[in-house]
Every structure is written in structure tokens, then in C-alpha cells.
């Protein structure tokens, strides 16, 4: 059997809503022919399912085989190195992969100007892989919150952080002209999920927006 292959040092999930990626660190001194076998265990079924026999990358998209994550007790994954006829011991994820491990994101933030007010609309993620009935708002049906970071340019570049409990918000601009920039980070008050800041969206207010149009 020759020298035993070392196991991948660590294996972990990095997940967003219906985007579930398994990662692992490479074994030391891997050869060009080293690849990695991935297996998955669903809690409650208790048998390992082989997912990939020979992945040469250091990550694997498990979304398609974990579509029921949001209605299940979760998963564990394991990875081992394979080189020809040799293989390493398995390295197993050290935490259960469940809905709690999913990092919350928003789809986008849209800003528009109306009567000198900036209206913000938070678009929820709509991943292609998600089954039709599994929308963000049906899975996280209560206690959705969003931290809003507002930056004014020109200005002293400090962010104003506020929490809102709706996907719509509006900004009172006090007649100020310039660029208003907004970032949003989602959370669910009843859950411990991490949230990720959206990319910054900006909109410019000029004097013309402060005339009465009522």
C-alpha cells in the first residue's frame, strides 16, 4: 500500500442561501495526481453517500444534494485524499451543517429619489437552485431585520447604522445635496446566523430634487 496519504487538515462549509460550498485545505506535498473524495451524511439517515470520487479542486458545490437543508436536521461532510491506489483517512466537518450555518445575504439594494426623499428597497436573494416554494421570506418568515449603513459624500465619512424591520426604508436627507451611499446587512432576530454586508449602492441628490412636486 506504500506510504499512507495524510488527511486533509480541515474541512468546512461556507454557505449562503441555497449556495452551499464545502471547502478543505490541501494535504501537504500533494502531487499532480492527488484528488479528493467527498461524501455526505444526512442526519437521520446515518449512512455516508459518496458525492465525488475525484475532485481536483479544494471546494465542492453541494447545493444540489442539500436542497432540503432548510427542512432537515442538517448534514455532515467528509473528505479524503486519493492518489492512485492510495487514500488517506477521512476528515469530517467538525460541526453540523444546518440552517444556522448559512450566512444571510440580500439580493441587492435599490435606491430611488422621490420628492427629495431616498427610497430604499431591499431585494431578497432569489437563487436559481432554490425550489419554487423555498423563498427567503418563507424560510425566514418572522423577525427579519436589516442593519442599514448610510454614508454621505461629501461629509465626514462616518456611517450611520440603524436597524429596520422591513424590506423598504426611506431616508430623510434634510435638503442636503451630494451622494448618499447605503449598505445593508440582513439578520433574523430569532436566529444566530451571521449576515454579510451588501455591496454599497449610491445615489446622487442635486438641488433639483427639492422642489415641491405634490
Amino acid at each position: 500500500h506504500g506510504t499512507e496519504l495524510p488527511s486533509p487538515p480541515s474541512v468546512w462549509f461556507e454557505a449562503e442561501f441555497f449556495h452551499h460550498i464545502l471547502h478543505w485545505t490541501p494535504i501537504p506535498n500533494q502531487s499532480e495526481s492527488t484528488c479528493y473524495e467527498v461524501a455526505l451524511l444526512r442526519y437521520g439517515i446515518e449512512s455516508w453517500n459518496s458525492i465525488s470520487n475525484c475532485s481536483q479542486t479544494l471546494s465542492y458545490d453541494l447545493t444540489a444534494v442539500t436542497l432540503d437543508l432548510y427542512h432537515s436536521n442538517g448534514y455532515r461532510a467528509r473528505v479524503r485524499a486519493v492518489d492512485g491506489s492510495r487514500h488517506s483517512n477521512w476528515t469530517v466537518t467538525n460541526t453540523r451543517f444546518s440552517v444556522d450555518e448559512v450566512t444571510l445575504t440580500v439580493g441587492s439594494v435599490n435606491l430611488e429619489i422621490h420628492n427629495g426623499f431616498i427610497l430604499g428597497k431591499i431585494q431578497l436573494p432569489r437563487p436559481k437552485m432554490a425550489p419554487a416554494n423555498d423563498t427567503y421570506e418563507s424560510i425566514f418568515s418572522h423577525f427579519r431585520e436589516y442593519e442599514i449603513a448610510i454614508r454621505k459624500v461629501p461629509g465626514n465619512f462616518t456611517f450611520t447604522h440603524k436597524k429596520v424591520k422591513h424590506e423598504n426604508f426611506s431616508l430623510l436627507t434634510s435638503g442636503e445635496v451630494g451622494e448618499f451611499c447605503v449598505q445593508v446587512k440582513p439578520s433574523v432576530a430569532s436566529r444566530s446566523n451571521k449576515g454579510m454586508w451588501s455591496k454599497e449602492e449610491c445615489i446622487s441628490l442635486t438641488r433639483q430634487y427639492f422642489t415641491v412636486t405634490n
Epitope: 420628492n115 430623510l172 435638503g175 422642489t211 405634490n214
Partner: nanobody
């Protein structure tokens, strides 16, 4: 310091109308925004309407858009909320609020400095 006094609340049948008034102790030009908020038992204060006093520009959340109208009378130092096509879910305590200058930007209760005592609106079906 700005004192605010609401009036005009009361009971009305669903589909009816009410007009709330908010009298300010200072001229409105010393205030950036005047707004109406409402709060029903066990819920947070939610914004209903806001007016930018310098231009008269207004904004309404979707829940009241097309039914409620905020307006101002600078001479009388008063802001009004005309409420039409009232529904039972409009039942709440209605508060008038003002802020001189906001660096908070977000249209929510925390952004407003001055508050009235509130006036009760009850809509029965």
C-alpha cells in the same frame, strides 16, 4: 425646545375620514421634518407620513399611500394628517413628531427629537 400638541382623534366607522392636527410651539421653518407616527398596543411606533417643511415635499409608506395626506400651514404653525378610507387596522395612538436637523437620515422613530402626547384613533368595522 419644540412643544407639539395633537388633536382631532376619535372614533369613526370603517371607510370614514378623520383629520388630525399638530400645533407646534415654534415656526415650522425652524424644523426640518414633521411627521406622523402611530402605535397600536404591543407594537412598535411606525411611520405614517412625513413632510419636509422647507419645500412641502411628502412621503408615505405603502400601508397608507393614497389614503392619508400630510400638509402644513406655516402661518398657523400646524401640520395636518387627513385620513380617508379608514380601516380597522388604522386603529392606534397617533403621534406628531419633529426634528430640526437629522444626521440619522433613516425615517424611523429614533430619528425624531420632539414628540406630542398622542391622540387616539379608533376605527370600528
Amino acid at each position: 425646545q419644540v412643544q407639539l400638541q395633537e388633536s382631532g382623534g376619535g372614533s369613526v366607522q370603517a371607510g370614514g375620514s378623520l383629520r388630525l392636527s399638530c400645533a407646534a410651539s415654534r415656526y415650522l421653518y425652524s424644523i426640518d421634518y414633521m411627521a406622523w407616527f402611530r402605535q397600536s398596543p404591543g407594537k412598535e411606533r411606525e411611520p405614517v407620513a412625513v413632510i419636509y417643511t422647507a419645500s412641502g415635499a411628502t412621503f408615505y409608506p405603502d400601508s397608507v399611500k393614497g389614503r392619508f395626506t400630510i400638509s402644513q400651514d406655516n402661518a398657523k404653525m400646524t401640520v395636518y394628517l387627513q385620513m380617508n378610507s379608514l380601516k380597522s387596522e388604522d386603529t392606534a395612538m397617533y403621534y406628531c413628531a419633529a426634528v430640526r436637523k437629522t444626521d440619522s437620515y433613516l425615517f424611523d422613530a429614533q430619528s425624531f427629537t420632539y414628540w406630542g402626547q398622542g391622540t387616539q384613533v379608533t376605527v370600528s368595522s
